[in-house]
Interface confidence: low
């Protein structure tokens, strides 16, 4: 059965997933997808890393930790009830059927109190390469290398004020962790 994690509407959700690189900087590709882990790859990919960089991510989904050390925990920004469900963290270890798969269940609870509406922060000043998306829907993605000359979608990421590092630390020990090598 899946490990269950909870968050309230409007909060950031944190889904822990870790591996230990065989050697420092010797990274393994990882994908995160919405839905249980299929036989291969990830379904409905929301974020992907390769041996050097995060090379694909979608709006509201980002890596908060140091993925160069194997912390590939997923942060989902400003969750809604629609974000509930199973998420797959797949550590794509080279070799046939070597992948490590972790299914994590996210349960979103209604907010205890409805916060007063606030003006959306514009992240341009602090994170100008990753801007807040103005539009909505499936077009809110960024991908590098998979399509020629696509427009980079402006998304928010790595925002200090959106971090909940205490939650991250609390969940680190109970997260999915494997050792490689």
């Amino acid at each position: 059965s899946e490990v269950e994690y909870r968050a309230e509407v409007g909060q950031n959700a944190y889904l822990p997933c870790f591996y230990t690189p065989a050697a420092p900087g010797n990274l393994v590709p990882v994908c995160w997808g919405k839905g249980a882990c299929p036989v291969f790859e990830c379904g409905n990919v929301v974020l992907r890393t390769d041996e050097r960089d995060v090379n694909y991510w979608t709006s509201r989904y980002w890596l908060n930790g140091d993925f160069r050390k194997g912390d590939v925990s997923l942060t989902i920004e400003n969750v809604t009830l629609a974000d509930s469900g199973i998420y797959c963290c797949r550590i794509q270890i080279p070799g046939i059927m070597n992948d490590e798969k972790f299914n994590l269940k996210l349960v979103i609870k209604p907010a205890k109190v409805t916060p007063a509406p606030t003006r959306q922060r514009d992240f341009t000043a602090a994170f100008p390469r990753m801007l807040t998306t103005r539009g909505h829907g499936p077009a809110e993605t960024q991908t590098l290398g998979s399509l020629p000359d696509i427009n980079l979608t402006q998304i928010s990421t790595l925002a200090n004020e959106l971090r909940d590092s205490r939650l991250a630390n609390d969940l680190r020990d109970s997260g999915a962790t494997i050792r490689i090598g």
């Epitope: 420092p24 960089d53 890596l63 994170f127 390469r129 290398g145 980079l152 790595l158």
Partner: antibody, heavy 121, light 107 residues
Framework: EVQLVESGGGLVQPGGSLRLSCAAS????????IHWVRQAPGKGLEWVAD????????EYADSVKDRFTISADTSKNTAYLQMNSLRAEDTAVYYC??????????????WGQGTLVTVSS | DIQMTQSPSSLSASVGDRVTITCRAS??????VAWYQQKPGKAPKLLIY???FLYSGVPSRFSGSRSGTDFTLTISSLQPEDFATYYC?????????FGQGTKVEIK
């Protein structure tokens, strides 16, 4: 083998213009960020501008904003720095360097050899 | 802009010495700090990325560490080819900013 080669530097009068080129080989600039960094004689390193060629998103240092324009041609795997209204304080060796889109990991892992820009009357 | 305050600005050391260079960020930069080595007339070379990762091909005598907003580059046993200028850099926010540099000279 990854390589970055700058060209286009030279002597120019104050108020003049130059266009620097950064020709990349061994990798696709569309998957990276290209940065320009300069170094005045005997001084430290100063970041100037960057571009995400796959989409054209650009950023500039305040000191060059509205005077310099960074661009890229992915078909030629080349980035450019158009420098207008040049001032004496723009005199420096200009380097292009390769970086990464995911900001947390955007260290500059390959650099060109540099091209010298001298602004003097 | 985030200031990277690097110290010392220069130091004299002998071959075999342990050398430590520090950089303090004016605000949180997480682990988004790199260290570069530059020799006269040459382009900088990446040594350490993400505060503590040794870049490919860099000798293991180089190491990096982080404590809050303080970052350290250590050369465990200085070699003749290590005499150069070293720069730290934060790449957490725009503009990326460099420290002033530390020149490591022969004693």
């Amino acid at each position: 083998e990854v390589q970055l080669v700058e060209s286009g530097g030279g002597l120019v009068q104050p108020g003049g213009s130059l266009r620097l080129s950064c020709a990349a080989s061994g990798f696709n600039i569309g998957k990276h960020v290209i940065h320009w960094v300069r170094q005045a004689p005997g001084k430290g390193l100063e970041w100037v501008a960057d571009i995400v060629p796959n989409g054209g998103y650009t950023e500039y240092a305040d000191s060059v904003k509205d005077r310099f324009t960074i661009s890229a041609d992915t078909s030629k795997n080349t980035a450019y720095l158009q420098m207008n209204s040049l001032r004496a304080e723009d005199t420096a060796v200009y380097y292009c360097a390769r970086g990464y889109v995911y900001r947390m990991w955007d260290s500059f892992d390959y650099w060109g050899q540099g091209t010298l820009v001298t602004v003097s009357s | 802009d985030i200031q990277m305050t690097q110290s010392p600005s220069s130091l004299s050391a002998s071959v075999g010495d342990r050398v430590t260079i520090t950089c303090r960020a004016s605000q949180d930069v997480n682990t988004a700090v790199a260290w570069y080595q530059q020799k006269p007339g040459k382009a900088p070379k990446l040594l350490i990325y993400s505060a503590s990762f040794l870049y490919s091909g860099v000798p293991s005598r180089f190491s990096g560490s982080r404590s809050g907003t303080d970052f350290t580059l250590t050369i465990s046993s200085l070699q003749p080819e290590d005499f150069a200028t070293y720069y730290c850099q934060q790449h957490y926010t725009t503009p990326p900013t460099f420290g002033q540099g530390t020149k490591v000279e022969i004693k």
